[in-house]
């Protein structure tokens, strides 16, 4: 902490401006009155105050605002946001999604630090849900943001977001995600047409059970190989040798290569030999 | 990949101006801050100042100021350091760099300088 | 300013033998300190920044520590290509300050 001192004549700041770059961090704490420097927080992130900087007008903001910032100087943060922590953090109440966008740049390019998953967690319960706005502001910055939802969060995500959902976003969902996904999903597309349906459902599949796996397969959709071993392997088990023939269509052939792994090599030991024989491929069950 | 390219070297009068350019590629050119710092023969760095491309916000070193004009020119990403009433203790290496993360002022990237020799 | 003293203005040290290099600030500077590796007619390349973080491809041989005042760069098992001046660099505070130099080289 930076010890009080007397500001030397004729610095102390009127104003928040470039000048005060060159302040060191005790005439910072001195010449810089608190309540002028949060009337003016949109000035601070237009000058490069260096992080050791930044400490001083933090504590400032501290001691001013002990019980949490307002949002009025919450979205002018910029990169103080980075000396923020997760407990200054928990006593925001953020409801403007372009003060978390402002957060969020601040952050860009970096992996989710606690202090983010702190602003988003305060932010999406403020708000009560996650809504397609949001979603879309969050895996805009974060891909992998929806995977690092508990199923009981997901549970809050209304259908209508999905929309807002890219495949890539889902990569490192695991099963027991995309079971909270996959109704949602189907009820967000169920208007579309065959193949543009195929098209959106298709990164959700992993949630899909058997019964919507066996409509699929009759609607000529040509799974791809990895979509298929994304499958839920008790959804796949079911599914007899023509079901399957049907749901991958040419990609068949590429079960040959994937006969030792899950779901196929189980689903290959609970069907007839008979029944792979007559797809061609050599697979032992 | 980042690229900063500066003009080539200048011999000036006591008295006279020079000014070096520093063209800049493989990254936004508005995104960041241009800083000069010169090198006198033998000696160590300096830092003169900075330039934001996007807003041409300008702040200088104490010691230049007055004599240093830092500009930009958007369209060809290129970015000026003039320096006026040049002195024989001016002569020097100049170079331009780069901070990307401005709250860590470290200088990321640099040209490969321009000699200016101030002499009668 | 923030005045940033380098000692020893040069240095001769055997291939493989360690090199160190100490700088002092006039301030607290807390851990804000770059050292820069520069080679003969090259510019300066960015070694460490936070006192002790190496920058992207810097071999492991480079190590940068201290805190407040005190800095020291050192090279473990100096090599031939490591023959250059090395500048600290404060950024606590603007302006931003250098140490005068180290010239580094093989004994």
């Known amino acids: 902490e930076v010890e009080k001192t007397a500001c030397p004549s004729g610095k102390k700041a009127r104003e928040i401006d470039e000048s005060l770059i060159f302040y060191k961090k005790w005439e910072l704490e001195a010449c810089v009155d608190a309540a002028l420097l949060a009337t003016q927080m949109d000035r601070v992130n237009a000058i490069p105050f260096t992080y050791e900087q930044l400490d001083v007008l933090k504590h400032k903001l501290d001691e001013l605002y002990p019980q949490g910032y307002p949002e009025s100087v919450i979205q002018h943060l910029g990169y103080l946001f980075l000396k923020m922590s997760p407990e200054d953090i928990r006593k925001w109440n953020v409801t403007s999604l372009e003060t978390l966008k402002a957060l969020l740049e601040v952050n860009k390019g970096h992996e989710m630090s606690p202090q983010v998953a702190t602003l988003i967690d305060r932010f999406v319960k403020g708000r009560g849900q996650l809504d397609k706005d949001t979603l879309d502001t969050l895996t805009a910055f974060y891909p992998g943001y929806l995977c690092s939802l508990s199923p009981e969060e997901l549970s809050s995500v209304p259908p209508s977001s999905i929309w807002a959902v890219r495949p890539q976003d889902l990569d490192t969902c695991d099963p027991r995600q995309l079971d909270v996904l996959y109704p949602k999903a189907r009820l967000a597309f169920q208007n579309m047409n065959g193949s543009e349906y195929f098209v959106k459902i298709q990164s959700f599949l992993g949630g899909a059970p058997t019964e919507d796996l066996k409509a699929l397969s009759q609607q000529n959709v040509s799974m791809d190989l990895a979509t298929f071993m994304k499958l839920r392997t008790d959804a796949v088990l079911p599914l007899t040798v023509a079901e399957v023939q049907k749901l991958l269509g040419p990609h068949v052939e590429g079960l040959k290569a994937e006969e030792r792994h899950r779901p196929v090599r189980d689903w290959i030991l609970r069907q007839r030999q008979d029944d792979l024989d007559t797809l061609g491929l050599g697979l032992q069950g | 990949q980042v690229q900063l390219v500066q003009s080539g070297a200048e011999v000036k009068k006591p008295g006279a101006s020079v000014k070096v350019s520093c063209k800049a590629s493989?990254?936004?050119?508005?995104?960041?801050?241009m800083h000069w710092v010169r090198q006198a023969p033998g000696q160590g760095l300096e830092w003169m100042g900075m330039?934001?491309?996007?807003?041409?916000?300008?702040i200088y070193y104490e010691k230049f100021q007055g004599r240093v004009t830092m500009t930009v020119d958007k369209s060809i990403s290129t970015a000026y350091m003039e320096l006026s009433r040049l002195r024989s203790d001016d002569t020097a290496v100049y170079y331009c760099?780069?901070?990307?993360?401005?709250?860590?002022?470290?200088?990321?990237?640099w040209g490969q300088g321009t000699l200016v020799t101030v002499s009668s | 300013d923030i005045v940033m003293t380098q000692s020893p203005d040069s240095l001769a040290v055997s291939l493989g033998e360690r090199a160190t290099i100490n700088c002092k600030a006039s301030?607290?500077?807390?851990?804000?300190v770059a050292w820069y590796q520069q080679k003969p007619g090259q510019s300066p390349k960015l070694l460490i920044y936070?006192?002790?973080t190496r920058h992207t491809g810097v071999p492991d041989r480079f190590t940068g520590s201290g805190s407040g005042t005190d800095f020291t760069l050192t090279i473990s098992s100096l090599q031939a290509e490591d023959v250059a001046v090395y500048f600290c660099?404060?950024?606590?505070?603007?302006?931003?300050?250098f140490g005068a130099g180290t010239k580094l080289e093989i004994k």
């Open positions: 301030h607290d500077v807390g851990t804000s």
């Open positions: 330039i934001h491309p996007n807003s041409d916000n300008t």
């Open positions: 936070w006192a002790s």
């Open positions: 760099a780069i901070i990307i993360t401005p709250v860590v002022p470290k200088f990321d990237y």
């Open positions: 660099q404060q950024y606590s505070s603007y302006p931003l300050t």
């Open positions: 493989g990254y936004t050119f508005t995104s960041y801050y």
